[in-house]
């Protein structure tokens, strides 16, 4: 798979492959994987990809299911790259405050907050 | 501050305090703090709160600016709690796949993806 495929297209294709291979993937009746109990997904990327690793190690490889796991590994690579960009630019306090304000604003309007 | 205040109310109050104390906070002309270069805030919570720590250590405390940093520390506590919940529940594969599908769906529709 060329890593040049846009990440948005990669995600779409991965969603389709996930549907296609669902029956194969759920064949292991006894396997248990940690599942986050809230919907703030970005907080849980580490656990999600650990779960994917567990699933991959328990799944017979070959054909397009291999492509599914390859895609998921490219998505992880993209997310790891995004995480690296969290601390790259050192800026004046006013800019940090604007980012903090935006973060809290998004938290206020978009996060699923259970008190 | 009672920690029983709902997190959503805490976030709203913190946004207001951030506006109130902006002039005081930006007084340090030479301080530089890492600012994430993308809008996927949840991926950067660690760096954001490190930045808040840097800012707090450089800010004269007292009055309601102290309340601002106390609030931010309670918000951090809430987010740390959410992160703990990422791997608490072990579930069958089909449940993990449902969560993974939702995660990719949200990534597909809501994330700011720069290829």
């Amino acid at each position: 798979i060329p890593t040049e495929i846009p990440t948005s297209a990669l995600v779409k294709e991965t969603l389709a492959l996930l549907s296609t291979h669902r029956t194969l993937l759920i064949a292991n009746e006894t396997l248990r994987i940690p599942v986050p109990v809230h919907k703030n997904h970005q907080l849980c990327t580490e656990e999600i990809f650990q779960g994917i690793g567990t699933l991959e190690s328990q799944t017979v490889q070959g054909g397009t299911v291999e492509r599914l796991f390859k895609n998921l590994s490219l998505i992880k690579k993209y997310i790891d790259g995004q995480k690296k960009k969290c601390g790259e630019e050192r800026r004046r306090v006013n800019q940090f405050l604007d980012y903090l304000q935006e973060f809290l604003g998004v938290m206020n309007t978009e996060w699923i907050i259970e008190s | 501050i009672p920690t029983e205040i709902p997190t959503s109310a805490l976030v709203k109050e913190t946004l207001a305090l951030l506006s109130t104390h902006r002039t005081l906070l930006i007084a340090n002309e030479t301080l530089r703090i890492p600012v994430p270069v993308h809008k996927n805030h949840q991926l950067c919570t660690e760096e954001i709160f490190q930045g808040i720590g840097t800012l707090e250590s450089q800010t004269v405390q007292g009055g309601t600016v102290e309340r601002l940093f106390k609030n931010l520390s309670l918000i951090k506590k809430y987010i740390d709690g959410q992160k703990k919940k990422c791997g608490e529940e072990r579930r069958r594969v089909n449940q993990f796949l449902d969560y993974l599908q939702e995660f990719l769906g949200v990534m597909n529709t809501e994330w700011i993806i720069e290829s």
Partner: antibody
Framework: QVQLQESGPGLVKPSQTLSLTCTVS??????????WSWIRQHPGKGLEWIGY???????YYNPSLKSRVTISVDTSKNQFSLKLSSVTAADTAVYYC?????????WGQGTLVTVSS | SYVLTQPPSVSVAPGQTARITCGGN??????VYWYQQKPGQAPVLVVH???DRPSGIPERFSGSNSGNTATLTISRVEVGDEADYSC???????????FGGGTKLTVLG
Amino acid sequence: QVQLQESGPGLVKPSQTLSLTCTVSGGSISNGGYYWSWIRQHPGKGLEWIGYIYYSGSTYYNPSLKSRVTISVDTSKNQFSLKLSSVTAADTAVYYCASLGNWFDYWGQGTLVTVSS
Amino acid sequence: SYVLTQPPSVSVAPGQTARITCGGNNIGSKSVYWYQQKPGQAPVLVVHDDSDRPSGIPERFSGSNSGNTATLTISRVEVGDEADYSCQVWDSSSDHVVFGGGTKLTVLG
């Protein structure tokens, strides 16, 4: 490498509104490390800061122009815009857009706007 | 609001040292940025954070800042250095950007 390009009419009539757009390429306008700024330069004079905007929409304006200036951002088009209302001949200048980190890193080439009837 | 004052012009012979000043109330507590602008071109940063040079800017360009005056120093001046030079700071009390009026550097001869 980030590049910025100003576009808009080069001639505006007095009392009308000057409108310019800056298109950003080679980088995302949603980059949290940058403000997006407008600066102008009257013929033979120094640089004058007009204002800047953050991707979230927070704006900061030069107090001397604040009552007439609006800066907006369109993250979907990777563009930001300047509107300056009630223009007079004194608003004739070269208008630059620029990215502003700790300093002005990248500049457009500038566009001359003449206010004349 | 905060005001920066620069001399309108400075003249210097090639090979000599040019000093361009930027005055402001307690400017030493602020970070100062210097831009070079040649006719018909956009400005280019030559010094940031008082005395740091961006990559690609010759070592001949240096800066200092203390008290009420920041100074851009260009040593061994060349004909190609002839340009307008502007200083810039942030006014942290208002989150505003402030430019000096600019100084025209003329290289004699």
